[in-house]
Amino acid sequence: NSLFNQEVQIPLTESYCGPCPKNWICYKNNCYQFFDESKNWYESQASCMSQNASLLKVYSKEDQDLLKLVKSYHWMGLVHIPTNGSWQWEDGSILSPNLLTIIEMQKGDCALYASSFKGYIENCSTPNTYICMQRTV
Amino acid sequence: NSLFNQEVQIPLTESYCGPCPKNWICYKNNCYQFFDESKNWYESQASCMSQNASLLKVYSKEDQDLLKLVKSYHWMGLVHIPTNGSWQWEDGSILSPNLLTIIEMQKGDCALYASSFKGYIENCSTPNTYICMQRTV
């Protein structure tokens, strides 16, 4: 148990969120971090992976309603598979119906998250800020 | 100790955030919630108080850097004191210099928070969405 060093007691009226990497946003037991530095999609993915996280996966408007108020455009983990014409997440799962409105501003196989559950198609090599996410167990 | 019912162990590499009211956003041990319903400033303040919270107080660009990405306009706990012409928070503390850029779009004694640490002056009776905040101890 050497990895564990804190013991906390939690009031019934309130709850702790996490665990998350230090100084990440915790919401409904998911962890989020917004990164300011602009990277292409692949570099953004690598950055998230290096922190035991992945690029943002949108799976629920209810559990992730904090995302509707996010300003600007940020890489998320959604990629286009040209051979079968599908948008899917890094983990291989298909985009769930009615979650995102995909807007094709230009040709590309990666997608930027924008407020109100919109996804903007972008060339994967274009530098952008990005959102990492870690789902707690 | 009847109010406490959970005991959790936290890995050193990660940390829990809070405690916060259930389903609030937790960031750097502060709790935030964005409310969709439009209320005037006084109703917004009452709503936050009923949840043992206050309207948003901006006290640190570093500790509250998640606020820079907030879209739209929301009541915060900043009010204008006509007698001395200062802007102060609900708790009576004066607005620290260089924290917010105050923009006088119209006459008013209340302020809306907008992204990138801007405050828009607004009539206190105008309905707007609002942000509640609870600082953890």
């Epitope: 286009h80 599908s86 298909i94 985009l95 409105t101 | -």
Partner: antibody, heavy 121, light 107 residues
């Protein structure tokens, strides 16, 4: 086995309306993009409209924009095409088609047998 | 809109022949090209997608190649059931467009 079955075609006067339906089975309807493609007698194929529930998008050929509306009922696994202000040049066999993925970039993987729409006075 | 021009529009060939149909796009479409076969009174059938991928269940005598603006469909050895009309289709951008078709008839 994937099946697409169109219905609702027939004879209609210019300016009239028709609603085509495409009942589907054998796949998870809501996960796939669907299109309507038409073929005028003795002519080639013309794409009409596209709908993807997953990616929240819809599009139309210029020739039908503002007159035709594509929709779907995922609970009934059915695709629809509401056709208003019909013209003689809309006369064609209308095919319902399933894309191979959830976006229009996927090829037309499966086709229905078609339903004939005739616009004539 | 992206125009697709197929050539030839009409082709007469014999069983056992090697046949090539070309499809030229008015602008680059990467590999977003599919080929379909249609027989009279029937719905089209997907043969090739992503320019060169063979659809499951389609005989290996059919093959596709190309990228960008120039694409080809090749039938290595014509069989009697291959006599039909063939269409190329691009899905690089909407509106989705088809070539005008190539009618393949028995010589």
């Amino acid at each position: 086995e994937v099946q697409l079955l169109e219905s609702g075609g027939g004879l209609v006067q210019p300016g009239g309306s028709l609603r085509l339906s495409c009942a589907t089975s054998g796949f998870t309807f809501s996960d796939y993009a669907m299109s309507w493609v038409r073929q005028a007698p003795g002519k080639g194929l013309e794409w009409v409209s596209y709908n993807s529930f997953s990616v929240g998008s819809t599009d139309y050929a210029d020739s039908v924009k503002g007159r035709f509306t594509i929709s779907r009922d995922n609970s009934k696994n059915t695709l629809y095409l509401q056709m208003n202000s019909l013209r003689a040049e809309d006369t064609a066999v209308y095919y319902c088609s399933k894309h191979s993925g959830n976006y229009y970039t996927g090829p037309f993987h499966y086709w229905g047998q078609g339903t004939l729409v005739t616009v004539s006075s | 809109d992206i125009q697709l021009t197929q050539s030839p529009s009409f082709l007469s060939a014999s069983v056992g022949d090697r046949v090539t149909i070309t499809c030229r796009a008015s602008q680059g479409i990467s590999s977003y090209l599919a080929w379909y076969q249609q027989k009279p009174g029937k719905a089209p059938k997907l043969l090739i997608y992503a320019a060169s991928s063979l659809e499951s269940g389609v005989p290996s005598r059919f093959s596709g190649s190309g990228s960008g603006t120039d694409f080809t469909l090749t039938i290595s050895s014509l069989q009697p059931e291959d006599f039909a009309t063939y269409y190329c289709q691009q899905s690089y951008s909407t509106p989705i467009t088809f070539g005008q078709g190539t009618r393949l008839e028995i010589k």
